[in-house]
């Protein structure tokens, strides 16, 4: 059963390491994949002393942990590298950090990247 699935055909692309990797630094990435597989967008970033440094954004292959996520939200508590994935075109344009501990109330730190 699949409820209200949104197709992902393109994602915001960013690569902080673009010169070494010989890619564009920023743009829109079309998402390719097998026709029977779902596609997602992702974002990964670091928080260096309160300053957000985007590492990469782009397309992500079919991954069940990305299903039914319309927003790109990292919920893990204090990761070294923040990661989120989502479904829907350009859904990784904005990403957020909502640490969700088992007992404590979630706190909100939404981020709009400006590469």
């Amino acid at each position: 059963a699949i409820l209200g699935r949104s197709e992902t055909q393109e994602c915001l692309f960013f690569n902080a390491n673009w010169e070494k990797d010989r890619t564009n630094q920023t743009g829109v990435e079309p998402c390719y994949g097998d026709k029977d597989k779902r596609r997602h967008c992702f974002a990964t970033w670091k928080n260096i002393s309160g300053s957000i440094e985007i590492v990469k954004q782009g397309c992500w292959l079919d991954d069940i942990n990305c299903y039914d996520r319309t927003d790109c939200v990292e919920k893990k508590d204090s990761p070294e590298v923040y990661f989120c994935c989502c479904e829907g075109n350009m859904c990784n344009e904005k990403f957020s950090y909502f640490p969700q501990m088992e007992v404590t109330q979630p706190t909100s730190n939404p981020v709009t990247p400006k590469p």
Epitope: A1, R5, D36, R38, L61, K75, D77
Partner: antibody
Framework: EVQLLESGGGLVQPGGSLRLSCAAS????????MSWVRQAPGKGLEWVSA????????YYTDSVKGRFTVSRDNSRNTLYLQMNSLRAEDTAVYYC???????????WGQGTLVTVSS | QTVVTQEPSFSVSPGGTVTLTCGFN?????????PSWYQQTPGQAPRTLIY???TRSSGVPDRFSGSILGNKAALTITGAQADDESDYYC??????????FGGGTKLTVLG
């Protein structure tokens, strides 16, 4: 520490029903896809079912479609497997597994034994 | 119906190297299937060894490594030890929620 504790297994007659539960702790349950995997006595592991973070998408191996239903209660940190119309070939240890990015099983429960026999 | 194939059994001498493989009936295994590997000893729950083709799970010794060899996923154990004697399972993620286990390989460490 991540813990997955299955319960609800037991002896049931063919055609009967059982509901398995998996109580999760030590991680943000609502942020993880989950799966059920089973192992018949002396046999290999077999993926049974999976469910997305919200419960909005559910998946099954062909042999249990229409008979088994996977669900989750994110407020209770619990995963369920409702098993109806049970057959002898469903006899197995049922493991609950946490699914992480790259769609792999990063943590496993200790399993609960389901025996279908008359 | 996708069938994932593994060698049913394999033997290795202590200190030796063994490579277990994982293929499937409908084409080549690639990194997009996120191959993962699990170790299981009798009566125990499985233990995660390798995920995403070649990433070792936390606490797994570097004697275990994963790769793609030709059209199959592979698990290589170097410097095999007596306690590596176990069943090893590969899993391929077929997409759209579906995981498929291989039949498992029973590894015997000789001696």
């Amino acid at each position: 520490e991540v813990q997955l504790l299955e319960s609800g297994g037991g002896l049931v007659q063919p055609g009967g029903s059982l509901r398995l539960s998996c109580a999760a702790s030590g991680f943000t349950f609502r942020n993880s896809a989950m799966s059920w995997v089973r192992q018949a006595p002396g046999k290999g592991l077999e993926w049974v079912s999976a469910i997305s973070v919200t419960g909005g998408s559910t998946y099954y191996t062909d042999s249990v479609k229409g008979r088994f239903t996977v669900s989750r209660d994110n407020s209770r940190n619990t995963l369920y497997l409702q098993m109806n119309s049970l057959r002898a070939e469903d006899t197995a240890v049922y493991y609950c597994a946490k699914v992480y990015y790259y769609s792999f099983f990063d943590y496993w429960g200790q399993g609960t034994l389901v025996t279908v026999s008359s | 119906q996708t069938v994932v194939t593994q060698e049913p059994s394999f033997s290795v001498s202590p200190g030796g190297t063994v490579t277990l493989t994982c293929g499937f009936n409908s084409g080549s295994v690639s990194t997009s299937y996120y191959p993962s590997w699990y170790q299981q000893t009798p009566g125990q729950a499985p233990r995660t060894l390798i995920y995403n083709t070649n990433t070792r799970s936390s606490g797994v010794p570097d004697r275990f490594s994963g790769s793609i060899l030709g059209n199959k996923a592979a698990l290589t154990i170097t410097g095999a030890q007596a306690d590596d004697e176990s069943d090893y399972y590969c899993v391929l993620y077929m997409g759209s929620g579906i995981h498929v286990f291989g039949g498992g390989t029973k590894l015997t460490v000789l001696g």
